[in-house]
């Protein structure tokens, strides 16, 4: 006897990182025939949607027109078919950005590095924060967390060409309230010092600090739910 339905998928469009005063839509995808979806915020009921007609709809959207720090936090959703409720979705961490100040980001030895060299990013923010986040832009976005009174170090490497890309950092005032992003730093990785033909497709990062999270883009949304389930909860917890 089945006691619950499979958990729905939850994600944010266009992104789980939302600049303050901007809009965001939380999407919850369950099953066709679901008569009710509930969105929970920080463990409490936040919103309800009853799709019509339920047999033709398997996804609902909860629209937040004006993001602020009160709306930032952990969301989950559930759905109901008849009297049977689903398992709750994974947690979606919705982050408000562009709060207060802008950090500065520098990279050592510089933005142009040689394959095999070790690289360190430094993020600095003079206002009261002790947690920093470094993000690499792209569809498969890597987020690293660092700590320090006014600045944090983010070691990388030895780098391969897979580390090429644009990096930004944020100061974090709490888990769900981040600063403005720093100016971007574009890391260029050139010429192999040694044979790096066996280098992995994607850089490997220390397991305790790195997670892989998919970012939505305005040019198209990835509908692979197995991938969409990787939201930022591991980073932010």
């Amino acid at each position: 006897q089945q006691q619950t339905l499979p958990k729905p998928f939850i994600w944010a469009e266009p992104h789980f990182m939302v600049p303050k005063e901007k809009q965001v839509t939380i999407c919850c995808q369950g099953n066709y025939g679901a008569v009710e979806y509930q969105l929970h915020f920080e463990g409490s009921l936040f919103a309800v949607d009853r799709p019509k007609p339920p047999e033709r709809i398997n996804k609902v959207q909860f629209y937040i027109p004006d993001m602020n720090s009160r709306m930032a936090g952990q969301y989950s959703c559930i759905y109901r078919v008849g009297e049977l409720w689903s398992e709750p979705s994974n947690l979606l961490d919705l982050v408000v950005t562009e709060m207060y100040d802008t950090p500065t980001l520098s990279v050592h030895p510089g933005p142009e590095v040689i394959s095999g060299e070790k690289v360190t990013f430094y993020c600095r923010l003079d206002t009261a924060t002790s947690m920093f986040l470094l993000l690499k832009e792209g569809r498969s976005s890597h987020v690293q967390r660092g700590y320090g009174k006014v600045q944090a170090e983010f070691p990388l490497g030895p780098v391969t060409t897979a580390h090429r890309g644009t990096y930004r950092c944020f100061g974090s005032y709490n888990n769900h309230a981040w600063s403005f992003p720093s100016e971007p730093v574009k890391l260029l990785v050139t010429g192999d010092i040694e044979n790096t033909s066996l280098a992995p497709e994607d850089p490997t990062f220390p397991a305790d600090t790195w997670g892989t999270y998919l970012l939505t883009t305005e040019t198209g949304l990835q509908k692979d739910h197995a991938l969409w389930d990787h939201t930022a909860q591991n980073l932010l917890r």
Partner: antibody, heavy 115, light 107 residues
Framework: QVQLQQPGSVLVRPGASVKLSCKAS????????MHWAKQRPGQGLEWIGH????????NYNEKFKGKATLTVDTSSSTAYVDLSSLTSEDSAVYYC????????WGAGTTVTVSS | DIQMTQSPSSLSASLGERVSLTCRAS??????LNWLQQEPDGTIKRLIY???RLDSGVPKRFSGSRSGSDYSLTISSLESEDFVDYYC?????????FGGGTKLEIK
Amino acid sequence: QVQLQQPGSVLVRPGASVKLSCKASGYTFTSSWMHWAKQRPGQGLEWIGHIHPNSGISNYNEKFKGKATLTVDTSSSTAYVDLSSLTSEDSAVYYCSRGGRFDDWGAGTTVTVSS
Amino acid sequence: DIQMTQSPSSLSASLGERVSLTCRASQDIGSSLNWLQQEPDGTIKRLIYATSRLDSGVPKRFSGSRSGSDYSLTISSLESEDFVDYYCLQYASSPWTFGGGTKLEIK
């Protein structure tokens, strides 16, 4: 070409402070890290710290925290190291070096701490 | 901190001889290693960066290589101006650290 100009020598009293300069030219000052290193007579080199003129981000060798303070003046393309509470142990040659990979080096400033 | 153990601390050699200096890193530094040359007047010049890349203007008789955690500077045929001090420097992990130095003396 890149030049890093440092004063030749300076004599200071024990307990005093001194601010050493490194005037850069021949490259974009704000785009490169500036390192400082110390070399005691007949000894090897020690890294003091570095600073990025564009961001103001600085990083120190734990050994020199409280002893050295790094600053820059971007208007004059000059980097500084401030050494405080000087003792005979601080008598050394102090070098500035440009770039994350220590691409170029100044000629060094000899600091003599003596009463 | 990463320790850079440089050997030998001093080396006597003859003109035209081939010599190698070695630095061993206590932790992985990738290819983030320089070789520096210091003249008797204190002037410091970088010879090699990123383990094996020769700086412009540096004679081809200098070369750098790596085997595991051992990094080497080789001078293929010593000339009179090469009899000075040499240091390795890792810039992989802060604090950046130097080897203890090698004094190259003429035999």
